[in-house]
């Protein structure tokens, strides 16, 4: 992938819109289709004031851990869906799109150099454990996906891309 493709705002925008659309088709988070078991996902909350002052390396760790857990969560949802009788086709389609989207974003971030931030020297303080929560519906899962892209991922790539422009 071209090194700074993720710095083209249209790229991330496409995935954000796909995630929001997936959330919308699941008929609301209260009454939409349920997951047959709870799935652990990253907590997507961003403390705007503290995030802005985090080292870009710390941001990278949070983004990378979140992306990894989110990918596992959506693969788990895909497996649960495959095991259910007559899974809704639209749901299947959006799960497949999310998996493909997360794979692409992971590759783009790798090219951007986000992964090297995880290789911290042995004497550095280990990163704080990733905050997580559990979801019980497909809507909530897609909502976390949309929030993660719109929040931490967009804030992080924005910062890295800005630095690269200097």
């Amino acid at each position: 992938a071209p090194p700074r493709l993720i710095c083209d705002s249209r790229v991330l925008e496409r995935y954000i819109l796909e995630a929001k659309e997936a959330e919308n088709v699941t008929m609301g988070c209260a009454e939409g289709p349920r997951l047959s078991e709870n799935i652990t996902v990253p907590d997507t909350k961003v403390n705007f004031y503290a995030w802005k002052r985090m080292e870009v390396e710390e941001q990278a760790i949070e983004v990378w851990q979140g992306l990894s857990l989110l990918s596992e969560a959506i693969l788990q949802a895909q497996a649960l869906l495959a095991n259910s009788s007559q899974p809704p086709e639209t749901l299947q389609l959006h799960i497949d799109k999310a998996i493909s989207g997360l794979r692409s974003l992971t590759s783009l971030l790798r090219v951007l150099g986000a992964q090297k931030e995880l290789m911290s020297p042995p004497d550095t303080t280990p990163p704080a454990p990733l905050r997580t929560l559990t979801v019980d519906t497909f809507c909530k899962l897609f909502r976390v996906y949309a929030n993660f892209l719109r929040g931490k991922l967009k804030l992080y790539t924005g910062e890295v891309c800005r630095r690269g422009d200097r």
Epitope: E13, T44, K45, F48, Y49, A50, F148, R150, K154
Partner: antibody, heavy 123, light 109 residues
Framework: QVQLVQSGAEVKKPGSSVKVSCKAS????????ISWVRQAPGQGLEWMGG????????DYAQKFQGRVTITADESTSTAYMELSSLRSEDTAVYYC????????????????WGRGTLVTVSS | SYVLTQPPSVSVAPGKTARITCSGD??????VHWYQQKPGQAPVLVIY???ERPSGIPERFSGSNSGNTATLTISRVEAGDEADYYC???????????FGGGTKLTVLG
């Protein structure tokens, strides 16, 4: 129930400073950021900046950078907004708003508002 | 800095549906929040995250965000809905909360 009680109206001279307070009750003060928003007569809402009481980090809109200082005193559950070098265009109602993470939001929203403090700048 | 554009005024008859728009570049990529402000009062959050309603806000209030426009829809409009309505987004490129210019909703009759 969350309540934000703001200090009373002020009349100030151009070039002077004003400090508006916002006392919060209900809920844990340090858990929620406080934003300040102003509204000039007959105009819309304008975000000035805010503070995260846990870290003490404040952030300001570009327009007010260097003129506004936002602080928080955890012991009294009070946030403050000080605006210096006042000019007539600063005549406005100044609101504090407490931010809250609603279910499913990645970013806190301005959920609770004070009743506003009218600051009049006049010579 | 990001700009949100709202019509200055919208008029509607009681019992009808009012639609207040808010437009901005690639607005569907943002989460839009809506506030209601009655004369002499502080703003009140009526919709957050495009289409979610805080508790205590009637079901008549709903939101959507697609195309280049976010819309606040108030169905079965009542006289008490007369107010100014503001849309809001967080613009991470400037790290600012941005408000639209506001729309005055007038309930006719």
């Amino acid at each position: 129930q969350v309540q934000l009680v703001q200090s009373g109206a002020e009349v100030k001279k151009p070039g002077s400073s004003v400090k508006v307070s916002c006392k919060a009750s209900g809920g844990t003060f340090r858990s929620y950021a406080i934003s300040w928003v102003r509204q000039a007569p007959g105009q819309g809402l304008e975000w000035m900046g805010g503070i995260d009481p846990i870290s003490g980090f404040a952030d300001y809109a570009q327009k007010f950078q260097g003129r506004v200082t936002i602080t928080a005193d955890e012991s009294t559950s009070t946030a403050y907004m000080e605006l210096s070098s006042l000019r007539s265009e600063d005549t406005a109602v100044y609101y504090c708003a407490r931010e809250l993470y609603y279910p499913g939001t990645w970013m806190a929203v301005m959920a609770y508002w004070g009743r506003g403090t009218l600051v009049t700048v006049s010579s | 800095s990001y700009v949100l554009t709202q019509p200055p005024s919208v008029s509607v008859a009681p019992g009808k549906t009012a639609r207040i728009t808010c437009s901005g570049d690639n607005i569907p990529e943002y989460y839009v929040h809506w506030y209601q402000q009655k004369p002499g009062q502080a703003p009140v959050l009526v919709i957050y995250r495009d289409n979610e309603r805080p508790s205590g806000i009637p079901e008549r209030f709903s939101g959507s965000n697609s195309g280049n426009t976010a819309t606040l829809t108030i169905s079965r409009v009542e006289a008490g809905d007369e107010a100014d309505y503001y849309c809001q987004v967080f613009d991470e490129s400037s790290w600012h909360w941005v408000f639209g210019g506001g729309t005055k909703l007038t309930v006719l009759g």
